[in-house]
Interface confidence: medium
Amino acid sequence: LPAQVAFTPYAPEPGSTCRLREYYDQTAQMCCSKCSPGQHAKVFCTKTSDTVCDSCEDSTYTQLWNWVPECLSCGSRCSSDQVETQACTREQNRICTCRPGWYCALSKQEGCRLCAPLRKCRPGFGVARPGTETSDVVCKPCAPGTFSNTTSSTDICRPHQICNVVAIPGNASMDAVCTSTSPTRSMAPGAVHLPQPVSTRSQHTQPTPEPSTAPSTSFLLPMGPSPPAEGSTGD
């Protein structure tokens, strides 16, 4: 005969655990239903009645099956210089990200408190290390035989074109200029770009009895340009 399916609430067999989407209520000493994402426990279960769930109120959410007494608050509204990449719904937190070309320079558990512009490497310097979610661009002088003629947070140093006859030799900030005959080898037109970093998205644990990967709001602060470092510009 097939085993009977127990309906919540029910007392688990000694040594066994509750099923998926159920939790063990210490007070009732019963396996009870969890609430679905977007809901919270309005009334906890008893020996004779199951959990009563209710929808999260506006500006609050739960992302996991849970039995929390109240939903989590969505993070702060995004500032004018942020992009809301995920809206606050009953099932997910708001996510604010730095605008393109910026990175998170000061963060806390709630997210990014300071969004700063990525350093731009000036002509004669190229990107040695691209910016990331939490680190600035690192510039380096273009080595002999390479150049960068742009002010950019993404362009690397590119090799000079190789000429049959050189009209003007290249330097760190200018490509070689060939005489009217075409060069033997040249780079494809246009600068070489490195990918832009994705703005910070900090992880924040939802206080439910199981771990959450709910991303918390990134808080961003539009700030003035970084002070010029060697080979960089704040413009």
């Epitope: 500006s59 989590l72 608050s73 969505c74 993070g75 702060s76 509204r77 500032s79 320079a105 000061l106 806390k108 558990q109 709630e110 408190r113 300071l114 700063a116 600035d136 924040h204 206080p207 918390s216 808080f219 961003l220 602060l221 700030m223 003035g224 340009p225 970084s226 002070p227 704040g234």
Partner: antibody, heavy 120, light 111 residues
Framework: QVQLVQSGAEVKKPGASVKVSCKAS????????IDWVRQATGQGLEWMGE????????YYNEKFKGRVTMTRNKSISTAYMELSSLRSEDTAVYYC?????????????WGQGTLVTVSS | DIVMTQSPDSLAVSLGERATINCRAS??????????MHWYQQKPGQPPKLLIY???NLESGVPDRFSGSGSGTDFTLTISSLQAEDVAVYYC?????????FGQGTKVEIK
């Protein structure tokens, strides 16, 4: 306008605990940090820690860890600071202050202060 | 912890004269071109009041005779023309990292 109103003065015996409340109004309580700062009579300001009411996350000054607990009640926009194992040197005015998540990153509005006296 | 040291401890200035308070941090309070240094004014029996945030930004409603400058570890609060209502204790504070720390305070009086 932003307002932080704190609970009244307290007199406690050494070893006891005190819980100070701070009711916020005039802004979205869950959006910004509430910091707690104390000032002994005639002394300077000392940061105790802060709470982010949206999530309940707390950041404590190591000096007070184990003795201080910061909580909040979102439904009544109130933050609390409880200090346990009180000693005479904890006699001070305790202030709550709002610190914006981004923008100033400074304490731009303060409560009126709560005097806590620890005396046997 | 970042230690904040103010100088002088007290300052007596004539009405209408300039008052200058210095604050030195034990390590830089800058991050990506921003200084996380703030100045507060506290009058007897009152909570502190924010005057200047992030080194040089005047808080709304604060008279423009107050100004802040500096970066890295050295910062200055200037009162360009001292008024009677400016008699108070002034504190610097850093919020670059926990624990946030204050200077010991500078008492400004009228000469």
């Amino acid at each position: 306008q932003v307002q932080l109103v704190q609970s009244g003065a307290e007199v406690k015996k050494p070893g006891a605990s005190v819980k100070v409340s701070c009711k916020a109004s005039g802004y979205t309580f869950t959006d910004d940090y509430i910091d707690w700062v104390r000032q002994a009579t005639g002394q300077g300001l000392e940061w105790m820690g802060e709470i982010y009411p949206g999530s309940g996350n707390t950041y404590y000054n190591e000096k007070f860890k184990g003795r201080v607990t910061m909580t909040r009640n979102k439904s009544i926009s109130t933050a609390y600071m409880e200090l346990s194992s009180l000693r005479s040197e904890d006699t001070a005015v305790y202030y709550c202050a709002r610190s914006q998540v981004y923008g100033k990153i400074a304490m731009d509005h303060w409560g009126q202060g709560t005097l806590v006296t620890v005396s046997s | 912890d970042i230690v904040m040291t103010q100088s002088p401890d007290s300052l007596a200035v004539s009405l209408g004269e300039r008052a200058t308070i210095n604050c030195r941090a034990s390590e830089s309070v800058d991050n990506s071109g921003n200084s996380f240094m703030h100045w507060y004014q506290q009058k007897p029996g009152q909570p502190p009041k924010l005057l200047i945030y992030r080194a040089s930004n005047l808080e709304s409603g604060v008279p423009d005779r107050f100004s802040g400058s500096g970066s890295g570890t050295d910062f200055t609060l200037t009162i360009s023309s001292l008024q009677a209502e400016d008699v108070a204790v002034y504190y610097c504070q850093q919020s670059k990292e926990d624990p946030y720390t204050f200077g010991q305070g500078t008492k400004v009086e009228i000469k």
